[in-house]
Amino acid sequence: LTCLGGFASPGPVPPSTALRELIEELVNITQNQKAPLCNGSMVWSINLTAGMYCAALESLINVSGCSAIEKTQRMLSGFCPHKVSAGQFSSLHVRDTKIEVAQFVKDLLLHLKKLFREGQFN
């Protein structure tokens, strides 16, 4: 996580700052949502447990042509230790359960806020 924030600031970013910035971005998305987010695209739901950053990225990376979540995708890639590409399928996905991107973002945001409150940044 120490190399996060390359697009936002020149130096390394503390994990708490990186998580705070991700939360801020998800809040921006929910606040600025007028039309259905990403045209109502559906993504795999995930289990919000260890490894959920990669799982979240694996879900969202399959949404193309949605500028609203591009920054989120970039930020999540900083939290995920391995390279993620479209079509990957994690064991953390809830099989057969797809939800709208807007709901996915809300669920992820709530979970990240709780992690921030508990001081769990990694």
Epitope: L19, R20, L48, K106, L110, K113, K114, R117, G119, F121
Partner: antibody, heavy 125, light 112 residues
Framework: QVQLVQSGAEVKKPGSSVKVSCKAS????????MHWVRQAPGQGLEWMGT????????KYVPKFQGRVTITADESTSTAYMELSSLRSEDTAVYYC??????????????????WGQGTLVTVSS | DIVMTQSPLSLPVTPGEPASISCRSS???????????LEWYLQKPGQSPRLLIY???DRFSGVPDRFSGSGSGTDFTLKISRVEADDVGIYYC?????????FGQGTKLEIK
């Protein structure tokens, strides 16, 4: 509107258990932490523990560890606090409270913004 | 456990006069995320507690601007610029930064 409605007063014998409920309305309990705080007669407030109803994770004050169990049922929007091996010193008003998280602030207040009306538990032989 | 010590324990105030309550923590209560979860609650006679101030100085919605919080590290203060009769009750500080979270012993504000 937001409400936390607790179960009624209880009289218990020493050594027994009590389970107090806290029914939430006007919000989703998975978006919160639910806390339990107690107040002995004429005394101050004492935080006992909390639960994240989204995943069941709990935190307890060490002095209550092993005697207190906090649970939550998302389907009924109800939080519970069970205290076992009761003794006379456990006579108190027990409050539930919530800390809410929302979509519209990056840094919520996280504090206990709504409280139940309190449940008096009397432990007496 | 972090001990929260309030002073004074009893505070008689004339309506219209200011009031100040001090809260000292036994160790620094800055959370690992950089926030300080220092809160103030008021419990009026026969009622449940209610939130006044969170994160040291942020007023909760509906709380009059007569109430203000300040401080850092281990020393915190709740000020009421002009006390009203309706302000009577017991004021508690609370730290939610380090588990177990703890309350101060309370300060009883009464009208002279």
């Amino acid at each position: 509107q937001v409400q936390l409605v607790q179960s009624g007063a209880e009289v218990k014998k020493p050594g027994s258990s009590v389970k107090v409920s806290c029914k939430a309305s006007g919000f989703y309990i998975k978006d919160t932490y639910m806390h339990w705080v107690r107040q002995a007669p004429g005394q101050g407030l004492e935080w006992m523990g909390t639960i994240d109803p989204a995943n069941g994770n709990t935190k307890y004050v060490p002095k209550f560890q092993g005697r207190v169990t906090i649970t939550a049922d998302e389907s009924t929007s109800t939080a519970y606090m069970e205290l076992s091996s009761l003794r006379s010193e456990d006579t108190a008003v027990y409050y539930c409270a919530r800390s809410i998280y929302d979509d519209y602030h990056y840094d919520d207040y996280y504090a206990m913004d709504y409280w139940g009306q309190g449940t008096l538990v009397t432990v007496s032989s | 456990d972090i001990v929260m010590t309030q002073s004074p324990l009893s505070l008689p105030v004339t309506p219209g006069e200011p009031a100040s309550i001090s809260c000292r923590s036994s160790q620094n209560i800055v959370h690992i995320n950089g926030n300080t979860y220092l809160e103030w609650y008021l419990q009026k006679p026969g009622q449940s507690p209610r939130l006044l101030i969170y994160k040291i100085s942020d007023r909760f919605s509906g709380v009059p601007d007569r109430f203000s919080g300040s401080g850092s590290g281990t020393d915190f203060t709740l000020k009421i610029s002009r006390v009203e009769a309706d302000d009577v009750g017991i004021y508690y500080c609370f730290q939610g930064s380090h588990v177990p979270w703890t309350f101060g012993q309370g300060t009883k504000l009464e009208i002279k």
